[in-house]
Each structure stands twice: as structure tokens, then as C-alpha cells.
């Protein structure tokens, strides 16, 4: 028998520095977690103690904090090189700055193979990107070889900016011939490493003949055997065992997100490359694990540029940006409009001639808007200003919801109106009229939404049975501020870009902004 240790991360999302327990900015260092300096310590400890170790990343290193905003992927290459990852799969967010924003900072600089079997380049891009990412890689591990085959969510064109010269094929269809190729090369130990979410990970384990282990990402799935060490609730045991169609027991793993855990899976193979046993658990990277001095010093060095960036002007406002709770928790506020407009702008994807865009709607809890921005400071808007407006380090995500769920959400928005509560929704691509004289749960008297399957966008009444795409904060997607109906009834949820980054990019693009209060939210009774 031959034993392999698989260390794995996924959806790190730019958390190079240690974070608080909820993966936001570290405040009390003695209680902080994760970060590459701490990850390095644990990885080196395991590499010293065990003979056959692979360190793998299942995608979405890009996007999530000011680190990515400033360094644009160079930080990912630098620190992943320092940690000597053995392989990485491309995630959807690796395409957030377009193909060039992937090629230059990461693909050309990485000292490890970057993989995806189901992304095919065409046209002029094919020769430019050739060899920079691979469908699979055979890695020597001790006296054996292990094949790693990569995959990426086929939804990436709707979630990021891969352009028109990359085709995202069905994962299973693309993986099978690559695995078959590895088998003909006498590689009998094969790991599928990819970024399509836990459901697809399980399908790959079930359907792709010859895959021994699946290491996934995208869905931020936390798996654990026994008592979990922090706040995350396990979605199943670690590893999650799938019985394949040809009768094999295939372990499937994922390690939550944000570098909070290091996935740790021990696999025992027989001489024919069959999995005999698999066991392990994610390792919580808490403060009991010291941060490595060399990596930490490098982090401190790179950090300086971030501090300088946060005070630079992104653009100007010529109007007061009203982000006060007195406005945003009671009525339409222009800060809410600005943020929602930025959220939609960030999701412009012309993937189908029938649609002017795949999504037109935004909702945003008023309680998530934490500060106004005064225009009387020469109109200057900085990252620091935006961090005061959006201090929670969230993301703006894409969900699919039925019209009936949206209706419930808007009823919840005003079910206890007048108490300055955070659930009052700011909107984009939506016209809503409330009648507060009616009883809670029946106050939405008009709800019109902007069409997507149209050449001239116009507002049509919401249809209860229709499925709509909506951009909203991850806080709402997870049922925050009492929006349990969104969490319970959403049909799809894909995590998006860092909230501040979305707004800052929009302001930089527009250069001068002047959002108005324009009748997106109305009240039909005389009291408003």
C-alpha cells in the first residue's frame, strides 16, 4: 500500500492576511485565523512529518479584498509560489479581470501547473494561452506518480469575464477523455481538482470513470467528521464518500473558504491504484498555529502599497451620497441606488443575443449601508470612504429566485416598517410601491421588474412563477436580516465580487457620479 496526503484549499478569495473568525478583517490578532503565513507553517509541518504530500488549490484565489484590487493577481502568484503549491484549478473568479488579467499576473508567473480540462481556447487566444494552463498534469510524488485533472464551472461566462474566445464545456464530458488519456499513460492514481461546486463534485465522482478522489470548490462547502472546531456547520462527513457508477467508493472533499481551514486528506492506494482507505478532516488554522516569520514579513512588505491605495481618489461625486440610516432604512436613498447600479454594472454579460443582459435586478438591505459620503470634500471618493459605507467585507452575489420568493422578500422589507430596522430594501431594476396602511405581509401593492429578454428595457409586473436572476449581498443570500425565504427558496447561488471593489470599480469607470432619488421605491398612502 502507498499513502498520499492531500492538503487542499479553495475559495481563498484574497485572504492573504489573517482574518477574524468570520473571515472579515482581523481586529484582535490573538483570535485571528488563516492567512498565508499561518498556512505555510502548517503545510511545512506536515511536509516535514509525512513523505508523500500534495498541496492543491481548487480555484477562486482571485477577488475578495483590497489585496486583489491593488495587486490584481500578482499577489496570488507570489505567495502561492512561496508556499510551493503543487497544482491549482481555475475558478470562475480567476477571469474577473478578463483573460489578460489571468495570463499576465498568474499563468505566466506561477511555478505550479494551473489546470482546467473543460475550458477550450479558440481563435487568436488559442496560441496566446497555449501551454499556460493544462487539462491535466502528472506529478511525481515520492516514487509514484499522481495525475491531477482540472475543471471549472461552466457557468463562468455568467459569473465573470472570460471573453468570447474561451468555451466552457460540460465538466463530465470534458473530463472523461482526459482521465482516459492518463490511464493510457499508466497513471493509476487520479485526482479531479476543480471549481464547480459540491453537487458537480459528487456527480464527477459518480460519473467519471477512473477518478479516485475529487477535490472541489465554489460552493464553500464545509465537511467535517466529529465535532467541528469553529462556527461552520458541516454539510456532511469529511471525506464525503460517493459510490461511483462502476462501484468504487470515491472520496469527495472541500475545505470551506477564505483560507480558514487547510483540507487534510490521507488516501491509501493499493499497487493497482485503487483507493483502499481515506480519512482526514479540515485543519482549523487558528492562532495556536504561529505565522511563519518569512512569509509574514513579506506580507507586511506588500501591505504598504495597500495602505497608500486606500487614500487615493477613485472618482468624484457632485452630490451628497446619503447613506444615513435615517434615509436608507426608511425610503429610497441615493447611496442605495448608487450601490445597486454598480452591482448591475458589474454583472453586465452579453452572452445571448436575446437578452440585453442576463440580470437586471438588485436588492440591498438598507442596514448594510453604514455611512454617507459628503460631497463637500472636493467631491473626492476614496477606498477608505467606501470601506466606511460597506465595512463588512461581503460580496455581491448572483442568485436565482422565483417571483413568489421576491414578493415575500419585499413584504419582509416593510413588515415592521418605522423601527429603523436593517431589512428595508434598496433596489435597482425594480419599482416597488408599498401601502403601509395594510397589514404586514400584504403591503406590497405594486412590484414591477426590468425585463432582461428585451432590446429596450422596460418595467413589467413581477410574475410569481417565473424564475428571476437577482444580484444581492451574500448576507441576504444567507438569510441575513430575517430574509430566511431567500436562503430557503433560492434555486441557485453563485458568490460574486467583493462589495467595495464593485462600487469602487464603478466609480472609477464613471469618474463623476450624481445618483438621484428617482422613484424606485414609493408609498401609496399619504403619510409618505
Amino acid at each position: 500500500a502507498w499513502e498520499l496526503t492531500i492538503l487542499h484549499t479553495n475559495d481563498v478569495h484574497s485572504r492573504l492576511e489573517q482574518t477574524s473568525e468570520d473571515s472579515s478583517k482581523c481586529v484582535n490578532a490573538s483570535r485571528c485565523m488563516g492567512g498565508v503565513a499561518r498556512l505555510f507553517t502548517k503545510v511545512q509541518q506536515i511536509r516535514r512529518a509525512e513523505p508523500n504530500v500534495l498541496l492543491l488549490d481548487a480555484g477562486d484565489q482571485y477577488q475578495g479584498t483590497i489585496w486583489f484590487t491593488v495587486y490584481k493577481g500578482a499577489e496570488v502568484a507570489h505567495f502561492m509560489n512561496a508556499l510551493r503549491y503543487d497544482a491549482m484549478a481555475l475558478g470562475n473568479h480567476e477571469f474577473d479581470n478578463g483573460v489578460e488579467g489571468l495570463i499576465e499576473p498568474l499563468l505566466k508567473e506561477a511555478k505550479f501547473p494551473i489546470l482546467s480540462a473543460n475550458i477550450k481556447a479558440k481563435g487568436p487566444l488559442a496560441s496566446q494561452i497555449s501551454g499556460l494552463y493544462l487539462p491535466y498534469k502528472v506529478l511525481p510524488v515520492g516514487d509514484e506518480v499522481v495525475g491531477i485533472v482540472g475543471y471549472t464551472s461552466k457557468e463562468t461566462p455568467f459569473l465573470s469575464n472570460p471573453g468570447t474566445n474561451l468555451v466552457f464545456e460540460d465538466e463530465i464530458t470534458a473530463l472523461q477523455p482526459e482521465v482516459d488519456k492518463l490511464k493510457t499513460l499508466n497513471v493509476n492514481k487520479i485526482i479531479a481538482l476543480g471549481h464547480s461546486g459540491f453537487e458537480m463534485d459528487k456527480l464527477i465522482a459518480q460519473k467519471v470513470r477512473g477518478v479516485d478522489v475529487v477535490v472541489g470548490g465554489h460552493s464553500n462547502t464545509f465537511l467535517y467528521t466529529g465535532n467541528p472546531p469553529s462556527k461552520e456547520v458541516p454539510a456532511g462527513k469529511y471525506p464525503f464518500i460517493v459510490t461511483s457508477d462502476d462501484g468504487r467508493k470515491v472520496p469527495v472533499v472541500q475545505a470551506y473558504a477564505f483560507g480558514k481551514y487547510l483540507g487534510y486528506l490521507k488516501i491509501e492506494f493499493d499497487e493497482r491504484g485503487n483507493v483502499i482507505s481515506s480519512h482526514g478532516n479540515p485543519i482549523l488554522l487558528n492562532s495556536s498555529i504561529p505565522e511563519d516569520p518569512s512569509i509574514k514579513a513579506d506580507i507586511n512588505k506588500w501591505r504598504i502599497k495597500l495602505d497608500n491605495y486606500s487614500t487615493q481618489e477613485l472618482g468624484k461625486t457632485i452630490v451628497y451620497l446619503d447613506g444615513s440610516s435615517q434615509s436608507c432604512r426608511f425610503r429610497e436613498c441615493n447611496m442605495g441606488n448608487l450601490i445597486c447600479d454598480a452591482m448591475i454594472n458589474n454583472n453586465l454579460r452579453h452572452t445571448d443575443e436575446m437578452f440585453w443582459n442576463h440580470v437586471s435586478m438588485c436588492i440591498l438591505n438598507g442596514g448594510g449601508i453604514r455611512s454617507p459620503i459628503d460631497e463637500r470634500n472636493n467631491g473626492t471618493i476614496t477606498w477608505e470612504n467606501l470601506a466606511a459605507v460597506l465595512p463588512f467585507g461581503g460580496t455581491f452575489d448572483l442568485v436565482q429566485l422565483k417571483g413568489s420568493t421576491l414578493k415575500k422578500a419585499f413584504e419582509h422589507s416593510v413588515h415592521r416598517y418605522g423601527q429603523s430596522t436593517g431589512e428595508f430594501l434598496q433596489v435597482g431594476g425594480i419599482h416597488v410601491v408599498y401601502d403601509l396602511s395594510r397589514k404586514p405581509g400584504d403591503r406590497v401593492v405594486k412590484l414591477d421588474v426590468l425585463c432582461t429578454k428585451c432590446r429596450v428595457p422596460s418595467y413589467d409586473p413581477l410574475k410569481m412563477d417565473e424564475v428571476y436572476k437577482v444580484i444581492l449581498p451574500n448576507f441576504l443570500a444567507n438569510g441575513g436580516d430575517g430574509f430566511q425565504m431567500i436562503k430557503d427558496e433560492l434555486l441557485r447561488h453563485d458568490s460574486g465580487d467583493q462589495d467595495i471593489n464593485v462600487v469602487s470599480t464603478y466609480i472609477s469607470k464613471m469618474k463623476v457620479i450624481y445618483p438621484a432619488v428617482e422613484g424606485r421605491i414609493k408609498f401609496s398612502t399619504g403619510s409618505h
Epitope: 511536509r47 513523505p51 512561496a82 511555478k111 516569520p293 518569512s294 514579513a297 513579506d298 507586511n300 512588505k301
Partner: antibody
Framework: QVQLQQPGAELVRPGTSVKLSCKAS????????MNWLKQRPDQGLEWIGR????????HYSQKFKDKAILTVHKSSSTAYIQLNSLTSEDSAVYYC?????????????WGRGTTLTVSS | NIVLTQSPASLAVSLGQRATISCRAS??????????MNWFQLKPGQPPKLLIY???TQGSGVPARFSGSGSGTDFSLNIHPMEEDDIAMYFC?????????FGGGTKLELK
């Protein structure tokens, strides 16, 4: 366990070249830099340079850039140092030592050293 | 290049007592919040062993009787209590910048 195996001794003539080896085992060879050091009884330890086995990227001390050439053979997990135009000044113990691929990282494992004697 | 001056050149210490070796750098080896001074033990016929890195962090498998301290330009290695197995040469080394440089060494003997 991590091991860096070096031959015990080499005897060569002045004016010739020599290629010293360092065979790594017990870890992923391409995952760490390989450094070479020189120790003469009168001059202490001197850093010659380093090589990244992943892509053979090298970095030399100014003092040794015309004296030493660092190479690797990935498939055998072996690092080499070639020393050219040898003189008695090159007689020394030469160590290979591993470090994580970041400038400030320490030399965490060492070979036993090869004693090079340059003599006619 | 950063020059490291180690003192004393030799030191005799009784079993169970404290041995202190000093290392002074010609310029600061501090770098973004850390001091990159390392300490090694060298015994005849054995590969050198990393004892302490970044001034005070213990190397893997190093006994607790070895400790390091200091910052900027002044550093020390402490061994307490001294054991027979500790008879060796000790070197300091800076890894703040290349070329990496070493102290001249301290020979630790038994009194």
C-alpha cells in the same frame, strides 16, 4: 526523512573544473531552493548562491558569479555545483542546503559537505 | 554586505550551566517586523543543524534549552542547562538579504 547526500571528498588539479553533487530525498525536490555554501577553516561560511529546481532560476553571490555554475537534474532530484579554473583558494568544504522559496527563509536541512582539495 | 561578529570565539561552560553566545551585525537585520538572524550547530562529520530562525523561533525538533533573542543588530543564543551533547561549533547567520552572511563561529566546550 529529508536527506541531502553529498560525496565525502574530491581531489582535483589546479586549472581544471569539478562538478559536485547533492542528491535530495524525502521531500519534493522542486518545492525548495537549493543553496550552496563554502567553508574554509580561516574564512568561516560563505554563501555561493541558490537555484530553484522548479525552473532552474539562479541567484549568485557577486563574489562567486564567475567561479560557480549551479544546475539541477529534476528526474534524479540532484543539484550540482560546477567550480571552474580551480586554485588552492577553492579548497574547502562545500555544503548544499535547502530553504523554502522565499528570500528570508532559513537553511532548514544541510548535507554533510564535500571536502574539495585542489592540489597538483 | 552585512558583517556578523560573533563572540566569544570559544566558550567553556559546566554541565547544567548557561551558555550565552553573542552576534552583532554591521547593520540592522530587521525586515518588516521581524529580525532575520538564524543560529546553527555544527558537529564534526554531521550536517549543520538549524537551531533558531528569525531571532527567536525554534527549529523543528530542537530542544527547549536552546533559545534566541535580540533585534536590530544585537542577538544572542542561550543554552540552558548545558548538556554534553551541546559541545559543538555555533554560527549565527543573517537571512535579511543576499548575500547571506555568517558569523565566524563560537566553539563551545565543557568546563
Amino acid at each position: 526523512q529529508v536527506q541531502l547526500q553529498q560525496p565525502g571528498a574530491e581531489l582535483v588539479r589546479p586549472g581544471t573544473s569539478v562538478k559536485l553533487s547533492c542528491k535530495a530525498s524525502g521531500y519534493t525536490f522542486t518545492g525548495y531552493w537549493m543553496n550552496w555554501l563554502k567553508q574554509r577553516p580561516d574564512q568561516g561560511l560563505e554563501w555561493i548562491g541558490r537555484i530553484d529546481p522548479y525552473d532552474s532560476e539562479t541567484h549568485y553571490s557577486q563574489k562567486f558569479k564567475d567561479k560557480a555554475i549551479l544546475t539541477v537534474h529534476k528526474s534524479s532530484s540532484t543539484a550540482y555545483i560546477q567550480l571552474n579554473s580551480l586554485t588552492s583558494e577553492d579548497s574547502a568544504v562545500y555544503y548544499c542546503t535547502r530553504s523554502s522559496p522565499i528570500t528570508t527563509a532559513p537553511f532548514d536541512y544541510w548535507g554533510r559537505g564535500t571536502t574539495l582539495t585542489v592540489s597538483s | 554586505n552585512i558583517v556578523l561578529t560573533q563572540s566569544p570565539a570559544s566558550l567553556a561552560v559546566s554541565l547544567g550551566q548557561r551558555a550565552t553566545i553573542s552576534c552583532r551585525a554591521s547593520e540592522s537585520v530587521d525586515y518588516y517586523g521581524f529580525s532575520f538572524m538564524n543560529w546553527f550547530q555544527l558537529k564534526p562529520g554531521q550536517p549543520p543543524k538549524l537551531l533558531i530562525y528569525a531571532a527567536s523561533t525554534q527549529g523543528s525538533g530542537v530542544p527547549a534549552r536552546f533559545s534566541g533573542s535580540g533585534s536590530g543588530t544585537d542577538f544572542s543564543l542561550n543554552i540552558h542547562p548545558m548538556e554534553e551533547d551541546d559541545i559543538a561549533m555555533y554560527f549565527c547567520q543573517q537571512s535579511k538579504e543576499v548575500p547571506y552572511t555568517f558569523g565566524g563561529g563560537t566553539k563551545l566546550e565543557l568546563k
